[in-house]
Every structure is written in structure tokens, then in C-alpha cells.
Interface confidence: medium
């Protein structure tokens, strides 16, 4: 942003009314009026080019410094070419000197040269030659100087003529401020420019109404340079939730729009299945029957639980059932659908029913399924099973109703074998089993699965047509998990429960029966 100039003294604007002091009085500098562009202008002029040594002073009125630290002095002046005078005017000069003096009070007409400090010798870029003078072409020069830091209540400027033909048309003294500024939704107050060229004054900004510093963000700051320019912006403000940036302000979201957090983004239209929001909304409420999960962004449409799985089949394979289903016809507007499978078993003789989660085995965990099939094994024979597949999504927990479909299946399979440990040694286990005689004719073979307890990565399988097996090459003093399962023409029969059998330690090496 451009620096703001605060004028302390403007000779050209004063219309000759300032009454500056000339020394010596009545000689040297003189207030003159002229016409330029058909307008009267005033100037302080001196042209004693033929009179030898000159020491003519022109002093301004006392200027109150106010809050200024560094002042800028802009001079507009014209200087005649010494060669334009007869004989070249040997004592003629083409420069003058600029001075200043600080003081806490106005000395009035008491002029003392010794109090003044020289700022610079002022030389023209262009002198007015005879032809320009004749044609009334004023070759106006503009020079600027600065002084600071100033510390007293006020100051004077003075112009020393040493024998030039010069006219001062404008003397403007001002200081610079960094202007009031709105940037990054932060307000920076008008700030006086510092006095030292390398230094930058750090200025804290204030967020405009309904704007905030974002979490973890830097507070807005800018730097006011000597020339009144704002530099190096740091940090910013953002429109708070419910408000959006419109030019340099934060404006409430219009009805039907919302903004859920402080950000640079504009207000968004309320998503589907929401009620029209009021002005300045941070979110849009869901229509009846629609919900928003805690993790759902406010920009997401409101959703509802899914309908039941569309189509469910249960195909029995021995002591296993494969369940298959298709996704719900109505997803509720969400993609985070998962399925839960629950199992109920009923005894045909008594008609009693109960949950069977503990006794069956699923091909993958039955809750939070994302696929649309699962295999259930270890089903008991002569049992009726009912499987329930429930579809759920992120908002199902917000309602009490459930969306599910059920399928029933009867199992006509072998009962699980009853397993006994017949004997053991340090390196072997002898195992036997039995099943009810009516089912024996359906059994083709028995499958013995065993593994060390705690070792889930590897297991061993032995198949036999008999009712016993000795498991060799085992580790001493080690517990093994052993299960026996009948294999029928229809597939796998029910497995026995898993037994824990331990080999002997090397000390007690006798072959003991249990």
C-alpha cells in the first residue's frame, strides 16, 4: 500500500500568506507573485548575481512536529543560467543551501544562523537558459531531502542564497504514515513511519468482525517501512464458521448455505436431505429420517440406514453352509455398508432354540463383513439353523430399527466324534474316537488335525479309516491341540471338540494310559 503523506508545511498552498523571515531584512529573498497557467502563484526569489559575496537567508515559520519522526522536504525551484546575464556575472552561483533547526519554542524574528544545521547543497538538474526565460518556460526542478529522527517540539527550515538567481515555488514538508489497511481480513491501524531507514516497525493486526486466526496459525502482523509502505505480511485471519469472505469483510452465509469451520472456502449450499438453513449457519440439519454420522463432514448429504440385504441364500454342504446375499436396494446414500451374520440353532425334537455363535466357525469374522458371502462350518447334524444377515451403515447406530434378512437350513450330518487319549510317551500320543453306530456307515474316513498349542501358523493332518491313531514324532512335554472330524460322501461332518493332550517329559518316560 502506498505511503500516506501528512503535510506539515505547504508554501505553494498558502497563497503567499506565510510571511517567512528574510535576513538581512529587505534585501536578498523577496516574496513575488507571478502568473502561471493563468493562475497567480507566489514564490520566494533572489537574484543578486552582480553584487559579489551574498549571504541571504530565508527562514520558514516555526513548524510543529507533532508525531513526525522523520520529515521529508520537497522543493520545487528554478535557477537561471549564470551565462544568461551580461558578462556571465562572475560572482553568480547556481546552487543554494538547505538548513534546519529544531526547537521547543518559536523564536519569532530572532534569527540566529548558528542554530541551523546544513542538510544539503541544492543544485538544479536543469537551469533556465536565456531562451527559456524569454519564452517564459520555467524549468522547474524538484528535489527531496529527509531529516530524522526529530526530537524537539518543532523545527524551522532555512534557505541560504550565496549569489544565485533562484526562485522557490514550492516548499512542502511532510512525514509519512503507513495508511490504515485491510489485508488478509485483518485491520492494520494507521502507523507513523519510523525514522531509521533499515528499521521496520512491526504492527499487530486485528481480525475483522467474524474473522479469526485459524488454529495453529500466526497472528496477523505487518511491517511499516520508513517510506510509509506496508511490507512483509505475516499470518492471516479467516472467516469463522457461518461466514464467508466478501471483498475485505466476512459476511454471514445466506439462508440455504453453511460453512462449518474457519477457512478460506466460501459458504456451501446445504446438501441433499437437509432442512433449509438460517443465515449464518455452520451446518444444515437433517430431514426427518435422515442422519449424519459423527465422522461425516457437514458438506455430506444426510443419509439413512440401508434396507435389508436384497437376496439371501443358504446352501448346505455337509456340516457347512455357504451364505450368499446381494446388497440392499437402498444404500441409504452411503457407501460404508457392512454386514453382520448371526446364527440360531433349533433342536427338532424339543423345538428349543438358542444362539450358536460359540459352536460354529465362520470363514471370516461375522461382524463388519464387507463381502456378500460367508461360509459357516462345524454345524451339528440333525439340527435346524437360522442365519440372519443384517445390513448396517454409518448411521444405523442412530436408529433402533434393524435391516435384516433370514435364511434357514437343516443339517443331516454326523455327530462330532467323541475323542479319548489312549496313551502317550515323550514323543507320541495315541488317540481313539467313536460316533454313534447308526452314523458309522456314512463315514468314509476320519481326519485328525493336530498342532502345538500356541502355534497357529502350522498344523498336521492325518487321515484314517479306523477309530484310532498314534501321532508320532512329537516334542516332549508339549501340549497339542487335537480334533477329529468324520468325512462323508456329502462332505465334512461335524468336528469333535478340540482336545488338549500333553506328551510326557523326558524324566517320566513310561507309556502311561489316561
Amino acid at each position: 500500500a502506498q505511503g500516506k503523506e501528512v503535510v506539515l508545511l505547504d508554501f505553494a498552498a498558502a497563497g503567499g500568506e506565510l510571511g517567512w523571515l528574510t535576513h538581512p531584512y529587505g534585501k536578498g529573498w523577496d516574496l513575488m507573485q507571478n502568473i502561471m497557467n493563468d493562475m497567480p502563484i507566489y514564490m520566494y526569489s533572489v537574484c543578486n548575481v552582480m553584487s559579489g559575496d551574498q549571504d541571504n537567508w530565508l527562514r520558514t515559520n516555526w513548524v510543529y512536529r507533532g508525531e513526525a519522526e522523520r520529515i521529508f522536504i520537497e522543493l520545487k525551484f528554478t535557477v537561471r543560467d549564470c551565462n544568461s546575464f551580461p558578462g556571465g556575472a562572475s560572482s553568480c552561483k547556481e546552487t543554494f543551501n538547505l538548513y534546519y533547526a529544531e526547537s521547543d519554542l518559536d523564536y519569532g524574528t530572532n534569527f540566529q544562523k548558528r542554530l541551523f544545521t546544513k542538510i544539503d547543497t541544492i543544485a538544479p538538474d536543469e537551469i533556465t537558459v536565456s531562451s527559456d526565460f524569454e519564452a517564459r518556460h520555467v524549468k522547474l526542478n524538484v528535489e527531496e531531502r529527509s531529516v530524522g529522527p526529530l526530537t524537539r517540539k518543532g523545527f524551522y527550515l532555512a534557505f541560504q542564497d550565496i549569489g544565485a538567481c533562484v526562485a522557490l515555488l514550492s516548499v512542502r514538508v511532510y512525514y509519512k504514515k503507513c495508511p490504515e489497511l485491510l489485508q488478509g481480513l485483518a485491520h492494520f491501524p494507521e502507523t507513523i513511519a519510523g525514522s531509521d531507514a533499515p528499521s521496520l516497525a512491526t504492527v499487530a493486526g486485528t481480525c475483522v468482525d467474524h474473522a479469526v486466526v485459524p488454529p495453529g496459525g500466526e497472528e496477523p502482523r505487518m511491517h511499516c517501512a520508513v517510506d510509509g509502505e506496508w511490507l512483509v505480511p505475516i499470518g492471516q485471519c479467516l472467516c469463522q464458521a457461518g461466514y464467508e469472505k466478501v471483498e475485505d469483510a466476512c459476511q454471514a452465509c445466506s439462508p440455504g448455505f453453511f460453512k462449518f469451520e474457519a477457512s478460506e472456502s466460501p459458504c456451501l449450499e446445504c446438501p441433499e436431505h437437509t432442512l433449509p438453513s438460517p443465515e449464518g449457519a455452520t451446518s444444515c440439519e437433517c430431514e426427518e429420517g435422515f442422519f449424519r454420522a459423527p465422522q461425516d463432514p457437514a458438506s455430506m448429504p444426510c443419509t439413512r440406514p440401508p434396507s435389508a440385504p436384497h437376496y439371501l441364500t443358504a446352501v448346505g454342504m455337509g456340516a457347512k453352509v455357504e451364505l450368499r446375499w446381494t446388497p440392499p436396494q437402498d444404500s441409504g446414500g452411503r457407501e460404508d455398508i457392512v454386514y453382520s451374520v448371526t446364527c440360531e440353532q433349533c433342536w427338532p425334537e424339543s423345538g428349543e432354540c438358542g444362539p450358536c455363535e460359540a459352536s460354529v466357525r465362520y470363514s471370516e469374522p461375522p461382524h463388519g463383513l464387507t463381502r456378500t458371502s460367508v461360509t459357516v462350518s462345524d454345524l451339528e447334524p440333525h439340527m435346524n439353523y437360522t442365519f440372519t444377515v443384517e445390513a448396517r451403515n454409518g448411521v444405523s447406530g442412530l436408529v433402533t430399527s434393524r435391516s435384516f434378512r433370514t435364511a434357514s437350513v437343516s443339517i443331516n450330518q454326523t455327530e462330532p466324534p467323541k475323542v479319548r487319549l489312549e496313551g502317550r510317551s515323550t514323543t507320541s500320543l495315541s488317540v481313539s474316537w467313536s460316533i454313534p453306530p447308526p452314523q458309522q456307515s456314512r463315514v468314509w474316513k476320519y481326519e485328525v488335525t493336530y498342532r502345538k498349542k500356541g502355534d497357529s501358523n502350522s498344523y498336521n493332518v492325518r487321515r484314517t479309516e479306523g477309530f484310532s491313531v498314534t501321532l508320532d514324532d512329537l516334542a516332549p512335554d508339549t501340549t497339542y491341540l487335537v480334533q477329529v472330524q468324520a468325512l462323508t460322501q456329502e462332505g465334512q461332518g461335524a468336528g469333535s471338540k478340540v482336545h488338549e493332550f500333553q506328551t510326557l517329559s523326558p524324566e517320566g518316560s513310561g507309556n502311561l494310559a489316561v
Epitope: M32, Q33, I35, P40, P86, E134, A135, V138
Partner: antibody
Framework: EVQLLESGGGLVQPGGSLRLSCAAS????????MAWVRQAPGKGLEWVSR????????HYADSVKGRFTISRDNSKNTLYLQMNSLRAEDTAVYYC?????????????????????WGQGTLVTVSS | DIQMTQSPSSLSASVGDRVTITCRAS??????LAWYQQKPGKAPKLLIY???NLHTGVPSRFSGSGSGTEFSLTISGLQPDDFATYYC?????????FGQGTKVEIK
């Protein structure tokens, strides 16, 4: 010594024309602004026209605008005034006058000029 | 146009007298004023320019003062050669105008 010598005056009928000349010597003619000033018999001085050192700009009094033309020939050190559509009230002694800013010790020239050097004048009589 | 009014139109004075002629402008002309002396049958001669500056070769008994609209020409000790008509001229505007003249006669 600066000398300005006017010529070309005389008796002329109303509506007629005359051309006045002013021969300059003793100074650098091309540095001077030149003018014509007239004085009716028994009356005061009246500025008529001016011309810049190199031939422009030119200015005229309202009373002669459109009828008189000022010009100069710096190679001949001569100033001219062409007077057309002459009227009885143009009867006067016509003076050639000059101004050199080098002798004007001011930093900014006045909006117009005064006249440092004058010729002896030539009489123009407009009468039927 | 700017009108220049001189007073008096004429005056009688003796050698050695102090004589003052005034010139009033119809609007401010700062110090852009010149004074001329004219003798019968002769061309005018420049005396003063810029209200108070004496032209080269003019005796120091002649002086000028004033600014704005009021100006004066003073002859501090009238000499026989000074009996003539005196004119003021403004050069604040392109239509340079003269006063009507003041005739200084021997008493």
C-alpha cells in the same frame, strides 16, 4: 550602443495597408523580444503587438487583432508590422521597442514584458 | 484587461523638490510594473522595472515602490532634465497596459 530605427510610415487612406520596418543594431537582435507601441497625437502610450526572440509566440492588442501582423527576420536584424484595413483611429507614432531578459535580474520572468530600448518612432496617418 | 490609473494627471514643481507619482492597478499585479519617462517628440525611456529596480544608467534620485495594486515613483530632488511626462506600465498580463501619464511641469 543599442539603436532601433523605424521606417515605412506615411499617409494612407482608410482601408489601406502599410508595412513598417525597424532596423536594429548594436546588440544581438536574436536575443531580444521585440514589440510595437503606438502613441496617438496628444495621447498616452498603447501596446500594439509583440514577438518572441525566435519568431514566436506573437500577441496582439484586441484593437488590432486580425488586421495587423508582426514578424521578424533575425538574419537581417529587422522587425516588421504589416498593417491592413487601416482605420482613422490607427493614426499614431509607431515605436519599435525591445527587451532583453539578460538585463532583467529576476529568477522568473514576468508574465509579459516591459521595454528597455525604444526607437524614435514613425508617424502613420490614416485619412481620406 | 487590467486598467492602470495614474495620479495626478499633471503637477507643477520646482527644481530640488521631492515629487511622488502614484499608479493604481485594477487588480493585483504583484511587482510587475515599469516606469517610463517621455519628453515631447522623443521616445519613452525606461526608468524602473519590477516596481523598484533601477534600470542601468538611470540616476539614483529616481526610486519606485509598491506591490499588488498600489505603486509610486519618487524623484527625490527634481532636476531641470526631469520635466517630462511619466508613464507606468503593468506587465502582469499579455495585454500590457500603460497608465494615461503624469505631466511634471516647472512651477
Amino acid at each position: 550602443e543599442v539603436q532601433l530605427l523605424e521606417s515605412g510610415g506615411g499617409l494612407v487612406q482608410p482601408g489601406g495597408s502599410l508595412r513598417l520596418s525597424c532596423a536594429a543594431s548594436g546588440f544581438t537582435f536574436s536575443h531580444y523580444m521585440m514589440a510595437w507601441v503606438r502613441q496617438a497625437p496628444g495621447k498616452g502610450l498603447e501596446w500594439v503587438s509583440r514577438i518572441g526572440p525566435s519568431g514566436g509566440p506573437t500577441h496582439y492588442a484586441d484593437s488590432v487583432k486580425g488586421r495587423f501582423t508582426i514578424s521578424r527576420d533575425n538574419s537581417k536584424n529587422t522587425l516588421y508590422l504589416q498593417m491592413n484595413s487601416l482605420r482613422a483611429e490607427d493614426t499614431a507614432v509607431y515605436y519599435c521597442a525591445g527587451y532583453d531578459s539578460g538585463y532583467d535580474y529576476v529568477a522568473v520572468a514576468g508574465p509579459a514584458e516591459y521595454f528597455q530600448h525604444w526607437g524614435q518612432g514613425t508617424l502613420v496617418t490614416v485619412s481620406s | 484587461d487590467i486598467q492602470m490609473t495614474q495620479s495626478p494627471s499633471s503637477l507643477s514643481a520646482s527644481v530640488g523638490d521631492r515629487v511622488t507619482i502614484t499608479c493604481r492597478a485594477s487588480q493585483s499585479i504583484s511587482t510587475w510594473l515599469a516606469w517610463y519617462q517621455q519628453k515631447p517628440g522623443k521616445a519613452p525611456k525606461l526608468l524602473i522595472y519590477k516596481a523598484s529596480n533601477l534600470h542601468t544608467g538611470v540616476p539614483s534620485r529616481f526610486s519606485g515602490s509598491g506591490s499588488g495594486t498600489e505603486f509610486s515613483l519618487t524623484i527625490s530632488g527634481l532636476q531641470p532634465d526631469d520635466f517630462a511626462t511619466y508613464y507606468c506600465q503593468q506587465y502582469n498580463a499579455y495585454s500590457r497596459t500603460f497608465g494615461q501619464g503624469t505631466k511634471v511641469e516647472i512651477k
